[in-house]
């Protein structure tokens, strides 16, 4: 007999679970960039933005050689979950100006919502624990100002758009190691 | 708007030493791996070498291990090149560049290195 | 000489479609991601295509990239005369933990 219903099954090709997370990555990270090109032409950015509740990077040209499967689609999935409760927050909070952008905004939150059930069937293939974030969640009030919500907007966006550019990099290169 | 900014080229001697900058702004450098890369007079596009966004890693072409060594100050926003050594053949403009994954997405407008007696 | 393999030059007439190749190995296009930069006459390099075939904000979609195994081609369709530019492919090596650049190809809109 094979194993007990809901017991997670280990895929017999990782690499094509992988291929599909991949894909799922780099559509969302093109989604990502034209939501942050199109918030850039409304509400043109003057300077940086940072929002001290965002993840901060897990990935860079240094972590990339001591890459492990395990570590990076757990930290990436705890990272995109914390993008997720900023995203729907901005959706909540985000006053009139950011309304403009509610399909959008609406649209960007349903593919994050996939790509982490994407993940999380990934490490549930790959029999991974699915880990707790380890960080305490900081609650997120509301913004001080209608320019407080753009300004996080523009934080947010370009967050998660530099974590799923390194995700895309990592995802590729773990596939070759596998 | 991103921008990057290069200086302190110029003309030096060989065996000479040169430092160049990289001055950033519009957005977080603290965020970012940064590259230099360079372009001989006429030739094509060579990578230098990369510094990890916080500075704790560092790699580097063949060409210049032992010779140039990269730099960040992120309270400065500014990437460092420090050449030493400097050869004939490492006349060229030098870019800076950032990186938010396998690719340089912002480049700036290079500064001219010449190597020569 | 130059780790990835590029056709010096290529040319088209306004409208037609260009395509320029770019072929490495398993150590680079292989296992890695392909980057193309356009450089026009006197300017720095600008980001054209990244992750093989994503277009980056600004890029107009007649410029398109492929990748199959370890060779790589950007094609720009609806060619027209501010094109002409450099265009280099580039992706990271494994076995020499860089990064590696075709010699670039010479793209004129006759």
């Known amino acids: 007999p094979g194993p007990p219903a809901g017991s997670p099954r280990v895929s017999s090709d990782p690499r094509a679970d992988l291929d599909s997370a991949v894909l799922l990555t780099r559509s969302l990270l093109a989604d990502t960039r034209q939501l942050a090109a199109q918030m850039r032409d409304k509400f043109p950015a003057d300077g940086d933005h940072s929002l001290d509740s965002l993840p901060t990077l897990a990935m860079s040209a240094g972590t990339l050689g001591s890459l492990q499967l395990p570590g990076v689609l757990t930290r990436l999935r705890v990272d995109l979950m914390s993008y997720l409760r900023h995203v729907q927050w901005l959706r909540r909070a985000g006053g009139p100006s950011l309304k403009t952008l509610e399909p959008e905004l609406g649209a960007l939150q349903a593919r994050l919502e996939r790509l982490l059930r994407r993940l999380q069937l990934l490490m549930s293939r790959l029999a991974l624990p699915q880990a707790a974030p380890d960080q305490p969640v900081i609650p997120l009030g509301p913004p001080a100002s209608a320019w407080g919500s753009i300004r996080a907007a523009h934080a947010i966006l370009g967050g998660l758009h530099l974590t799923l550019d390194w995700a895309v990099r990592g995802l590729l290169l773990l596939k070759t190691r596998l | 708007e991103v921008q990057l900014l290069e200086s302190g080229g110029g003309l030096v001697q060989p065996g000479g030493s040169l430092r160049l900058s990289c001055a950033a702004s519009?957005?977080?450098?603290?965020?970012?791996?940064m590259n230099w890369l360079r372009q001989a007079p006429g030739k094509g596009l060579e990578w230098v070498g990369v510094i990890s966004y916080d500075g704790s890693n560092k790699f580097y072409a063949d060409f210049v291990k032992g010779r140039f060594t990269i730099s960040r100050d992120n309270s400065k926003n500014t990437l460092y090149l420090q050449m030493n050594s400097l050869r004939a053949e490492d006349t060229a403009v030098y870019y800076c560049a950032r990186t938010p994954g396998s690719h340089f997405d912002y480049w700036g407008q290079g500064t001219l290195v010449t190597v020569s007696s | 000489q130059s780790v990835l393999t590029q056709p010096p030059s290529a040319s088209g007439t306004p409208g037609q479609r260009v395509t320029i190749s770019c072929s490495g190995s398993s150590s680079n296009i292989g296992n890695n991601a392909v980057n193309w930069y356009q450089q026009l006459p006197g300017t720095a390099p600008k980001l054209l295509i990244y992750?093989?075939?994503l277009l980056p904000s600004g890029v107009p979609d007649r410029f398109s990239g492929s990748k199959s195994g370890t060779s790589a081609s950007l094609a720009i369709s609806g060619l027209r005369s501010e094109d002409e530019a450099d265009y280099y492919c580039a992706a990271w090596d494994d076995s020499l933990n860089g990064v590696v650049f075709g010699g670039g190809t010479k793209l004129t809109v006759l």
């Open positions: 519009g957005f977080t450098f603290s965020h970012y791996d």
């Open positions: 992750y093989d075939d």
